[in-house]
Interface confidence: low
């Protein structure tokens, strides 16, 4: 039908820099290049209906749905969404096309649905339909990678059963300890699933997708290294694959490696060996012990023996369910205002945990470090000397763990005062929690030394937002003190602060702060 207008529907993705909700406008934002949504005429529909390609948006993303109409004359339009009817302001671009926009800022579940645009032009009427949905990250998964032996080859395949399909990479390092940190120049990354070079010191496989990154280290016993003071321990869940690599270097090829479980040789088919010469002509041998799907009876001491090296063992523990072992009793700390201090949690967990530190409803990233004894530790130092409650939360696929910490900062009280017609109150958050005195200033006591004991009520309250204690003292006003200046003083082991209040008849109350060390 040649009377039909030429319609173009586009999606513009924005880099978020605003927090309001959907607007029908041409709202200025930092934008990506527009994506054509097709806008085909819907077949077999009564009336003229154009349908744009479905739009999938990430939660909190900002987008603009835009329609460009190549039709003569003026156009009028109306957006309809759920209960909403939004008038729209069409404008014209440099090519004299009508432009109608719907801006959705910070996409939420409530803004997902069908957006209908009714357009009237001088020539005809038509409807344009946009379907906007939130990308279903609920179906997304990111599973820790595991290893398989490649059929008929001495190579390992790294597998991560994740949605969307993850990018798999091997992270290799030939140094020891600290120099094998992720961004170290000693680290080599290979974005492939199969690894043939299995002689390196440290071998990890990582999988990443929209949900993040998960890594698995190839558990290794190196017979040329001094054994750890505590026996290395490897945890696995029933059904997971077991892989342990034993590595040894010798001046020549005249040595062999064997694996034993609880003093019994591993069955054939549960191990394979590889060897190579290094640049200095020494022989490197590696012997893999593997079980494709572990059962409870695979638990035990796995010992790698060599004819030329002292043997070393590892304890493999097969569990039905993951766990997080740590003491969850709450801990209270008291530090000086400029003292360096970190919270720390020591735990043993399998599978590896995801964790956060939280203070005042704000979450902070959580780093964990493996210790030699099979434990891990997470530290939090970024408290900026703010007193209150700090929460460590950890979870893995099977377990959750929460630990509370209270931080108290030793400091001199600071006093705030407020007054009403019937009482005066003073507040302080110094630590240790202060004690209070009230004094009356009069002709008889110009230095305000006359103590008031009647009508005083002290209490401590938890300022919930930060989990921080605040002490307060209230003086009920009596005829005896009305019209006088009174002084409330808070004192602890670090000093004293006072505030002077004029107890007028109802009206504004001036306060004079008075700090005494």
């Amino acid at each position: 039908n040649q009377d039909l207008p030429v319609i173009k529907c586009v999606l513009i993705n924005h880099k978020n820099n605003d927090s309001s909700v959907g607007k029908s406008s041409s709202y200025p934002m930092v934008s990506e290049s527009p994506e054509d949504l097709g806008c085909a005429l819907r077949p077999q529909s009564s009336g003229t209906v154009y349908e744009a390609a479905a739009v999938e948006v990430d939660v909190s993303a900002s987008i603009t749905l835009q329609v460009l109409v190549d039709a003569p004359g003026n156009i009028s339009c109306l957006w309809v969404f759920k209960h909403s009817s939004l008038n729209c302001q069409p404008h014209f671009d440099l090519q004299n096309r009508g432009v109608v926009s719907m801006v959705i800022l910070k996409m939420t579940e409530t803004q997902a649905g069908e957006y209908l645009l009714f357009i009237q032009s001088e020539a005809t009427n038509y409807t344009i339909l946009f379907t906007v949905s939130i990308r279903n990250t609920l179906l997304y998964t990111l599973r820790r990678p595991y290893f398989r032996k490649m059929e008929n080859q001495d190579a390992l395949v790294c597998i991560s059963e994740s949605v969307p399909e993850p990018i798999v990479e091997w992270v290799l390092c030939d140094s020891q300890g600290e120099s094998c940190k992720e961004e170290s120049p000693a680290v080599v990354k290979k974005e492939e699933k199969v690894l043939h070079e299995l002689f390196g010191t440290d071998i990890r496989c990582c999988a990443r997708n929209e949900l993040g990154r998960e890594c698995t280290r190839l558990f290794t016993i190196d017979l040329n290294q001094t054994p750890q003071t505590t026996l290395p321990q490897l945890f696995l869940k029933v059904g997971e694959p077991l892989w342990i690599r034993c590595k040894a270097v010798h001046v020549n090829h005249g040595f062999g490696l064997t694996w034993e479980l609880e003093n019994k040789a591993l069955e054939e088919g549960n191990y394979f060996e590889m060897s190579t010469y290094s640049t200095n002509r020494t022989m490197i041998r590696i012997l893999f012990a593997f079980v494709s799907s572990v059962a409870r009876n695979d638990t035990g001491y796995y010992t790698c023996s060599s004819s030329k090296h002292p043997s070393q063992s590892a304890l493999v523990t097969i569990v039905e369910k993951g766990f997080i072992n740590a003491t969850n009793s709450s801990e209270d700390y008291e530090i000086d205002q400029y003292e360096e201090f970190c919270f720390s949690v020591r735990f043993k967990a399998y599978p590896q945990i995801r964790c956060t530190w939280t203070f005042s409803r704000k979450s902070f990233p959580c780093e964990q470090k493996g210790l030699d004894n099979g434990y891990s530790i997470s530290k939090f130092c970024n408290h900026k000397h703010q007193p209150g409650e700090y929460i460590f939360h950890a979870e893995n696929d099977d377990a959750q763990f929460t630990k509370m910490f209270t931080l108290n900062i030793r400091r001199k009280p600071q006093v705030l005062a407020e007054a009403s017609a019937s009482q005066a109150s003073c507040f302080s958050d110094g630590y240790p929690l202060p004690s209070w005195t009230w004094k009356k200033c009069s002709d008889k006591s110009p230095n305000c030394t006359e103590e008031i004991t009647e009508g005083v009520w002290n209490r401590k309250a938890n300022r919930k937002v930060f989990g921080q204690w605040v002490s307060s003292s209230t003086l009920n006003m009596s005829e005896a003190i009305k019209g006088f200046l009174v002084k409330c003083c808070a004192y602890n082991s670090l000093g004293t602060s006072c505030e002077t209040i004029l107890l007028n008849s109802p009206g504004p109350f001036p306060f004079i702060q008075d700090n005494i060390s």
């Epitope: 819907r42 529909s45 009564s46 009336g47 209906v49 349908e51 309809v80 969404f81 759920k82 209960h83 909403s84 009817s85 939004l86 069908e114 209908l116 009714f118 409807t127 339909l129």
Partner: nanobody, 110 residues
């Protein structure tokens, strides 16, 4: 298959009232629906719709005379038209989710 079926149109004298009904089948919710009309020789125009605060939106010329409502249990959108004028003569359509009904004819005689 989505179907919108208008009913309730007919011949009425100026000043009279009519109640139009739009039954929706194959459609999840009537929240999306709008009443439009097309008078002979004129463009189709918006009559009434729902607003974002759960209220209603009307063409300026119809305010106070027309009222849109919905019966979610029956998946029906209603248009109550009072104090009808000859210029309200038109085919009234309900539309929603990219679909249009066939319309119901309203004739207001003077």
């Amino acid at each position: 298959q989505v179907q919108l079926q208008e009913s309730g149109g007919g011949l009425v004298q100026a000043g009279g009232s009519l109640r139009l009904s739009c039954a929706a089948s194959g459609i999840f919710s009537t929240n999306y629906m709008v009443w439009c009309r097309q008078a002979p020789g004129k463009q189709r125009e918006l009559v009434a719709a729902f607003t974002n605060d759960g209220g209603t939106l009307y063409a300026d010329s119809l305010k106070g005379r027309f009222s849109i409502s919905q019966d979610n249990a029956k998946n029906t959108v209603l248009l109550l038209m009072n104090s009808l004028k000859p210029e309200d003569t038109a085919v009234y359509y309900c539309c929603g989710l990219g679909h249009w009904g066939r319309g119901t004819k309203v004739t207001v005689s003077s």
